[in-house]
């Protein structure tokens, strides 16, 4: 920020490092909850046409895949990894890829991933080989 920019009162919008550099925000797919045809695949595209600038620079991309007796949905959003999402911690927020991990939710199959490269929640990965052997 140039010297003439006033100091931020609400620092949520401006993440800075020790040298005073400002973090560029993440670009994420952001369609909230949509019906999905993604099922029994190693990976899926989100089919979300909206790429949003995350509101706060500390936010990362998140995808949530849910299946119950009636339908399958895929949720794509930005979220602050310091805060739980759907009651779960975003433990993989620093990953460049969105590698789905199953979470325990009664009455449904629930997978969630988070990642921190541009539009990384567009390609959601279920395949175990990424979880274990892929260094990316």
């Amino acid at each position: 920020i140039p010297p003439h920019v006033q100091k931020s009162v609400n620092n949520d919008m401006m993440v800075t490092d020790n040298n005073g550099a400002v973090k560029f925000p993440q670009l994420c797919k952001f369609c909230d909850v949509r019906f999905s045809t993604c099922d029994n695949q190693k990976s899926c595209l989100s089919n979300c046409s909206i790429t949003s600038i995350c509101e706060k620079p500390q936010e990362v991309c998140v995808a949530v895949w849910r299946k119950n007796d009636e339908n399958i949905t895929l949720e794509t959003v930005c979220h602050d990894p310091k805060l739980p999402y759907h009651d779960f911690i975003l433990e993989d927020a620093a990953s460049p890829k969105c590698i789905m991990k199953e979470k325990k939710k009664p009455g449904e199959t629930f997978f969630m991933c988070s990642c921190s490269s541009d539009e990384c929640n567009d390609n959601i990965i279920f395949s175990e080989e990424y979880n274990t052997s892929n260094p990316d």
């Epitope: 920020i1 040298n19 550099a21």
Partner: nanobody, 124 residues
């Protein structure tokens, strides 16, 4: 290196329109993703819109999507922001900023990254 200079701000009534420009001097404009960033009085930075150097793919904050349109003319080294249906909450100083490929941070006091800003006031 690229130096940035914004213009086009002013006073406008709610529902009105403005077009901001950001003129870049220097030969490397086409290497950068360009941003419009705003700061309302007493608030933090809000990253409003961005555009890629090649292909001109665009991105918007949810707060301005459908009202603001970012564009660039690489032959004129100029970035634009067309702002329609303006609201009181759009009142802010608007800055343009540049981002090199893969760059995660912008140096805070480096005017090579930021323009001086142009004030937009939306009021009746």
């Amino acid at each position: 290196e690229v130096q940035l200079l914004e213009s086009g701000g002013g006073l406008v009534q709610p529902g009105g329109s403005l077009r901001l420009s950001c003129a870049a001097s220097g030969s490397t404009f086409t290497e950068y993703r360009m941003w419009w960033v705003r700061q309302a009085p007493g608030k933090g930075l809000e990253w409003v819109s961005a555009i890629e150097p090649i292909g001109h793919r665009t991105y918007y904050a949810n707060s301005v999507r459908g009202r603001f349109t970012i564009s660039r003319d690489n032959s004129k080294n100029t970035l634009y922001l067309q702002m329609n249906s303006l609201r009181a909450e759009d009142t802010a100083v608007y800055y343009c900023a540049k981002q090199a490929p893969g760059e995660k941070w912008a140096r805070r006091w480096d005017l090579d990254y930021w323009g001086q800003g142009t004030l937009v006031t939306v009021s009746s």
